[in-house]
């Protein structure tokens, strides 16, 4: 049953909002999709979760949520925010999740984000962000997840990422990025997932992924690459790689030599004509390999060390004979 304290909590519930105890004697407040144009004023100091998404909030005043020192998650997605002032999140010492997606922000709200030392997840996707200031994430030492997809970025904000050594997942998909320079993610040694799909990437620095020592998932699908991304060779923990729907014509010898942990490679919808015979060697975790329309392949690929394939598809190639060892190489 509810304790006397939970009754006190629920009396601090703003009009029309839905409130419930969170099990720790704090309050979850859902004020989403109510047509609000400003923040509710009578919030309980014991609020741990506040959902203000899908409203008509167009501006935040400095210090609009005073005394919410227990607030851990703040959702402001789907509003009409164009700017967030300095001090908008002052006093939110416990804030771990901040959702600002689907607004009309043009810049990362640098000053407002300062000193959110507990922040672990930041959603800035689906805005109009074209510029990420160099120091905008400098105080976010706990940040684990960062969404910057579906914005208007034309380049990787290299300097801004330097302070995010704890980051584990990031998406920069659905932007207008055209090039990834050397050491673009050089300090992101904890990053496990990186999404770069649906950009305009046509060139990669030879060392653009250097420093990503924990990376397991890399998504380069739907870009304009016309050469195989050899920069992946430093990604020794890579498990899932996507570069389908690009303009890559060949996969070189020893293509995945630095990626022995690969389980999945998606590279369909590329005009691949040539595949180096040694390209898929020493991939013991690889389960599926599909090579369609590689017309310049004349020899069956050497699958030495790639012993756990469950599915191999080769169409449109010029292979005239199979090596005697092919049945030994496959399970």
């Amino acid at each position: 049953g509810s304790s006397p304290r939970s009754g006190v909590l629920l009396r601090g519930c703003p009009t029309h909002c839905h409130c419930e105890p969170d099990g720790r004697m704090l309050l979850r407040v859902d004020c989403s999709d109510l047509g609000l144009s400003e923040l509710p004023s009578n919030l309980s100091v014991f609020t741990s979760y506040l959902d203000l998404s899908m409203n008509n909030i167009s501006q935040l005043l400095p210090n609009p949520l005073p005394s919410l020192r227990f607030l851990e998650e703040l959702r402001l997605a789907g509003n009409a925010l164009t700017y967030i002032p300095k001090g908008a999140f002052t006093g939110l010492y416990s804030l771990k999740v901040l959702m600002l997606q689907n607004n009309q922000l043009r810049h990362v709200p640098t000053e407002a984000l300062q000193n959110l030392r507990s922040l672990q997840s930041l959603r800035l996707d689906a805005n109009h962000i074209s510029y990420v200031p160099p120091s905008c994430f400098s105080g976010l030492h706990s940040l684990r997840h960062l969404w910057l997809d579906d914005n208007a970025l034309t380049e990787i904000p290299v300097q801004a990422f330097r302070s995010l050594s704890a980051l584990q997942a990031m998406t920069l998909a659905l932007n207008k990025i055209h090039h990834i320079p050397d050491y673009a993610f050089g300090n992101l040694s904890s990053l496990v997932v990186l999404h770069l799909h649906n950009n305009r990437i046509h060139s990669l620095g030879k060392k653009c992924f250097d420093g990503l020592h924990s990376l397991e998932t890399l998504d380069l699908n739907y870009n304009n690459l016309d050469e195989f991304p050899t920069a992946i060779r430093t990604l020794s923990n890579l498990k899932e790689l996507g570069f389908h729907s690009n303009n890559i014509r060949s996969i070189p010898e020893k293509a995945f030599v630095g990626n022995p942990s690969l389980i999945t490679i998606h590279f369909y919808d590329n005009p691949i004509q040539f595949v180096g015979r040694s390209a898929f060697q020493h991939l013991p975790e690889l389960r599926t390999l599909t090579l369609n329309g590689a017309s310049q392949i004349t020899e069956f690929p050497d699958l030495t060390g790639t012993a756990n394939l469950e599915s191999l598809t080769l169409t449109g190639a010029q292979i005239s004979s199979l090596p005697q060892t092919v049945c030994n190489q496959l399970p």
Epitope: P181, D182, K207, T230, R233, E253, G258
Partner: antibody
């Protein structure tokens, strides 16, 4: 603990070749570039070239390109520098180093003295 | 090639005093906001040791009396309070473009 251990000192005649080795331990060998740098007696440091072990990715200082070959064997985590057509001005300590944070050279071998003398 | 020029060639500083070494590149070594300039310390008979990377970032384990600053073409290494163990030759290095190049070195001694 990251370590780079180089082969011992060499004395060579002019026109000969030398091959210096650099055995790495304490990290994933194929995930970092190995750089080669030399230092003539009493002089400064000069970059020779680099390799990403396991791949065919190498870069050379144009000054050495025709005489230098850098290779690596991932099975033994060892990188090699071979310099041919030796001359007296090649007398130097040759260092291997790991390309670390943003390409800075964060770990170095102890150096290999190559003396070229007739 | 990018030419790195250090000044002065040698420097004598009293214990506890500040030592400042300058390094100038013949062209900018900045790219996407990063300055690809690093500083090393070399003591006699030893390989160089990384002190500072990307112009101003202290390498792990390096005492905080060492600091770096600068961008573009002009960079500075500062030892805020010189200790006896800091006697060495200091080198700057750029890896903005091949061939990577070093300064000629600055010898730091105790006055």
């Amino acid at each position: 603990e990251v370590q780079l251990v180089q082969s011992g000192a060499e004395v060579k005649k002019p026109g000969a070749s030398v091959k210096v080795s650099c055995k790495a331990s304490g990290y994933t060998f194929s995930a970092y570039w190995i750089e080669w740098v030399r230092q003539a007696p009493g002089q400064g440091l000069e970059w020779i070239g680099e390799i990403l072990p396991g791949s065919d990715s190498t870069d050379y200082n144009e000054k050495f390109k025709v005489r230098v070959t850098i290779t690596a064997d991932t099975s033994t985590s060892t990188a090699y520098l071979e310099l041919s057509s030796l001359r007296s001005e090649d007398t130097a300590v040759y260092y291997c180093a790991r390309g670390g944070h943003y390409g800075s050279l964060d770990y170095w071998g102890q150096g290999t003295l190559v003396t070229v003398s007739s | 090639d990018i030419v790195m020029t250090q000044s002065p060639d040698s420097l004598a500083v009293s214990l506890g005093e500040r030592a400042t070494i300058n390094c100038r590149a013949s062209e900018s070594v900045d790219n996407y906001g990063n300055s690809f300039m690093h500083w090393y310390q070399q003591k006699p008979g030893q390989p160089p040791k990384l002190l500072i990377y990307l112009a101003s970032n202290l390498e792990s384990g390096v005492p905080d009396r060492f600091s770096g600053s600068g961008s573009g073409t002009d960079f500075t290494l500062t030892i805020s309070s010189l200790q006896a163990e800091d006697v060495a030759v200091y080198y700057c290095q750029q890896n903005y473009e091949d061939p990577f190049t070093f300064g000629q070195g600055t010898k730091v001694e105790i006055k």
